[in-house]
């Protein structure tokens, strides 16, 4: 069985302020089991944008229905983009662990740039 890969097809995405940004991410396998998370930035200071397991992320919607048991699409849409949202977004697969899940594999990242709102 091939090892899971995390595919973020776009290196960069440009969105006008006030619009929604779609950040695409797909897995090549459902195994190992464990949640998907999205982060802005990398390293210790990265910001959690979305956690499949839990939490309230009012500006984030998932493009696919994550409750499908065979779902491999973990793309997200972030609404009402502002310049403060600019940065590189990483789709990260975790494998289950106890007490904490373990980071398994990250996508290559998608850089979000924000254009000025058209006048």
């Amino acid at each position: 069985e091939d090892e899971l890969q995390v595919i973020q097809p776009e290196k960069s995405v440009s969105v006008a302020a006030g619009e929604s940004a779609t950040l695409r991410c797909a897995m090549t396998s459902l195994i190992p089991v464990g949640p998907i998370m999205w982060f802005r930035g990398a390293g210790a200071g990265r910001e959690l944008i979305y956690n499949q397991k839990e939490g309230h992320f009012p500006r984030v919607t998932t493009v696919s229905e994550l409750t499908k048991r065979n779902n491999l699409d973990f793309s997200i849409s972030i609404s009402n983009i502002t310049p403060a949202d600019a940065g590189t977004y990483y789709c990260v697969k975790f494998r289950k662990g106890s007490p904490d899940d373990v980071e398994f594999k990250s996508g290559a990242g998608t850089e979000l740039s924000v254009r000025a709102k058209p006048s």
């Epitope: 459902l30 195994i31 229905e65 409750t67 499908k68 048991r69 065979n70 289950k96």
Partner: antibody, heavy 118, light 107 residues
Framework: DVQLVESGGGVVRPGESLRLSCAAS????????MSWVRQAPGKGLEWLAG????????YYIDSVKGRFTISRDNSKNSLYLQMNSLTAEDTAVYYC???????????WGLGTLVTVSS | ALTQPASVSANPGETVKITCSGG??????YGWYQQKSPGSAPVTVI????KRPSDIPSRFSGSASGSAATLTITGVRVEDEAVYFC???????????FGAGTTLTVL
Amino acid sequence: DVQLVESGGGVVRPGESLRLSCAASGFTFSSYAMSWVRQAPGKGLEWLAGISAGGSDTYYIDSVKGRFTISRDNSKNSLYLQMNSLTAEDTAVYYCARETWNHLFDYWGLGTLVTVSS
Amino acid sequence: ALTQPASVSANPGETVKITCSGGDYYSTYYGWYQQKSPGSAPVTVIHSDDKRPSDIPSRFSGSASGSAATLTITGVRVEDEAVYFCGAYDGRTYINTFGAGTTLTVL
């Protein structure tokens, strides 16, 4: 509080059909996958079927595939199980259950009893 | 198939461990379900291997390693007498399965 209330159970003859319902309240029903689980008298739990939050994807154990159909109406906060060609082996208490993000169960209904007897 | 002992017994205050084997660690999540009488509604005491719902006492804990999961009740009480079913979700097959149940008797 999360509440799941099953209804529609009863006594039927072999070969007949029955439709079970599960009324959900206390949570955003349309955001959760749901399942049906049954327990035959003196036996353990048996998962039967699951359905995604939007209702587009369904999953079944082999023994009920083709006979049972799981469905939902998110506008009515309701889950259903259509059971056809019933046999004595389908006699059980039927529970609806809310799924967690990883398809285990966190809340269960009180159950409804289905008896198949001639 | 998930395998668990048919019965366990303990005195009040003791620690009880119930094991459940049969799943592959990398494709399986486990849960534990308490049923106090046949035909009564099950109660989830553990899901996602080790996650305890907020209304479940802290004496219940869960773990998983290798091909097995364990439910631990630390300081068991008389009201914990019940049948405990382990359950699993397999990400390879998309199927849920249950063990046959373990009857816990508190002496």
